[in-house]
């Protein structure tokens, strides 16, 4: 189906700012420095193509990408299909975040990305340092006390952690829009599952201790489990699609070159190992450092603490997919009753994990709802 790519999209070689301005939208690019020294690129689309004249404060919407991804996820389709552009055109002040370790967040004040120390993080640190630093920056820059948070995949995970453990940060979130939410991964059918067969003592032997490059680890599972489903030498070598799954029917195949050139955007081996721990335990908890002594050093307890989403009082709207391999409907089913302020839920039976960011019908299925919910919030 996608045997050959004709390099038709100029965004293939562009950075985030170039992608935004290519479509005629205004762009502001900032660097946010976290408490532990990571330098994260943050982009702003302050208004849309047709509403620059509207004065007054626009509601702020912050978009946070998922696992192995980056801010380009929100701008990889044509403007009428990309959530960031749709929100900007609807009159909102749109901000795009990046998590440490991805293409646009691979610098640190103290460590080089060539060092092991740079890569000693998982989604715990993204929640503890990246989100507060970025949200604080946006609040200061816009002068607005609250913002709307849209997370996809791991972007929801770090939201659950940050907003349940950091009450002052939670106060800054007007509404949390969770697309393909991931807390537990007890029932995941993603190939991330296969990583659980790698013993802890061998994980770094196989994958190293810096950036996560799966090399050919997944090859032994692909032929039977993924690639025989009518696809496709191209997607079968891409870690994002391997781990998240894909849906040929819902993809705009002419944009595939953009998706593949910007993904996977990179994360740490430690982060992938944390996800592996979560698959094994079936629990939503902090990184297990491997021994009671080391856990005590980090957490003052011998076991990593559990994350308690019931402590998150932020109003939350949830969209999940019935065919999602990573955010399995059973795991979402465990999550929903624990959310004390669930204001909306929709399961899209035929959606998989990446459909929420790239599906051709995402505006009809998801984005239009978000736009109208934010506008209701304004009143």
């Amino acid at each position: 189906l996608f045997g050959k790519l004709h390099p038709g999209s100029p965004e293939v070689t562009m950075n985030i700012s170039q992608m935004i301005t290519y479509w005629g939208y205004p762009n502001e690019e900032y660097e946010v420095v976290t408490e532990d020294g990571y330098i994260l690129e943050v982009n702003r689309i302050p208004y849309g193509k047709k509403n620059s004249g509207n004065t007054g404060q626009r509601p702020v919407v912050f978009l946070q990408h998922g696992l192995l991804a980056s801010a380009t996820n929100w701008i990889s389709n044509l403007p009428n299909n990309s959530l960031a552009f749709i929100l900007a055109d609807a009159g909102y002040d749109v901000w795009l975040g990046n998590s440490r370790g991805n293409t646009w967040a691979r610098r640190n004040l103290y460590y080089s990305p060539d060092s092991v120390e740079f890569w000693a993080f998982s989604f715990d640190e993204m929640a503890k340092y990246d989100l507060p630093a970025t949200i604080d920056f946006i609040v200061k820059k816009t002068g607005q006390k609250q913002l709307h948070y849209v997370g996809h995949s791991q972007g929801t995970t770090i939201g659950f952690i940050a907003f349940s453990t950091n009450p002052s940060l939670a106060k800054r979130i007007k509404t949390f829009y969770a697309l393909a939410p991931v807390a537990t991964v007890k029932y995941t059918k993603s190939l991330i599952n296969k990583l659980r067969f790698v013993p802890q003592s061998l994980f770094k032997f196989i994958f190293g201790d810096k950036i996560f490059y799966p090399h050919n680890f997944f090859d032994q599972f692909l032929a039977t489990e993924v690639c025989s489903r009518e696809m496709l030498n191209l997607l079968c070598s891409n870690a994002l699609f391997i781990i998240c799954g894909f849906d040929s029917k819902n993809f705009n195949t002419s944009r595939l070159d953009v998706y593949l050139s910007h993904n996977p955007a990179g994360t740490s081996v430690q982060n992938m190992f944390h996800w592996t721990q979560a698959v094994k335990s079936g629990k939503f908890q902090a990184y297990d450092w491997g021994s009671p002594v080391q856990n005590r050093m980090h957490y003052d307890q011998s076991q990593p603490p559990y994350y308690n989403v019931t402590a998150m009082n932020v109003p939350i709207a949830v969209w999940n997919g019935g065919k999602d391999l990573l955010a399995d409907p059973q795991d979402v089913g465990l999550l929903l009753p624990k959310l004390p302020n669930l204001i909306y839920h929709k399961e899209i039976p035929f959606y998989n994990h990446l459909d929420f960011i790239w599906a051709m019908d995402a505006p009809q299925e998801v984005y239009n709802d978000i736009v109208s919910m934010i506008s209701e919030d304004k009143k």
Epitope: S115, V116, E117, P199, Q200, S201, L202, K204, F205, G208, D209
Partner: nanobody, 120 residues
Framework: QVQLQESGGDLVQAGGSLRLACAAS????????MGWYRQVPGKQRELVAA???????YYVNSVKGRFTISRENAKNTVYLQMNSLKPEDTAVYYC??????????????WGQGTQVTVSS
């Protein structure tokens, strides 16, 4: 200077067996993990089997039930017992050891490789 030296590679008939050995010298630490990779000309080097210093093992699907990895921690030596060999097992087999004095100084150390040829 840490060095890894493989031995045991040979030409063998399909269905036959071989035992590869890899010995480390010059190391002031014991490896956290050791293992075997293989490479066919024109293809990427691929993991075959690995063993941690806690004894935990990992095998790729294609060799499960046929190959067994073991190690002698005291000697920093790792073995690969290969049974029921198939022509597709033909490759250069490389030994890898991973270790360091601290978690931030861990490195991968590689041997020079030993040729295994399985004829049909």
């Amino acid at each position: 200077q840490v060095q890894l030296q493989e031995s045991g590679g040979d030409l063998v008939q399909a269905g036959g067996s071989l035992r590869l050995a890899c010995a480390a010298s010059g190391s002031t630490f014991s490896f956290n993990a050791m293992g075997w990779y293989r490479q066919v000309p024109g293809k990427q080097r691929e993991l075959v089997a690995a063993i941690g210093n806690d004894g935990s093992t990992y095998y790729v699907n294609s060799v499960k039930g046929r190959f067994t990895i073991s190690r002698e921690n005291a000697k920093n030596t790792v073995y690969l017992q290969m049974n029921s060999l198939k022509p597709e097992d033909t490759a250069v087999y490389y030994c890898k050891g991973r270790g360091g004095l601290t978690q931030y100084s861990e490195h991968d150390y590689w041997g020079q490789g030993t040729q295994v040829t399985v004829s049909s």
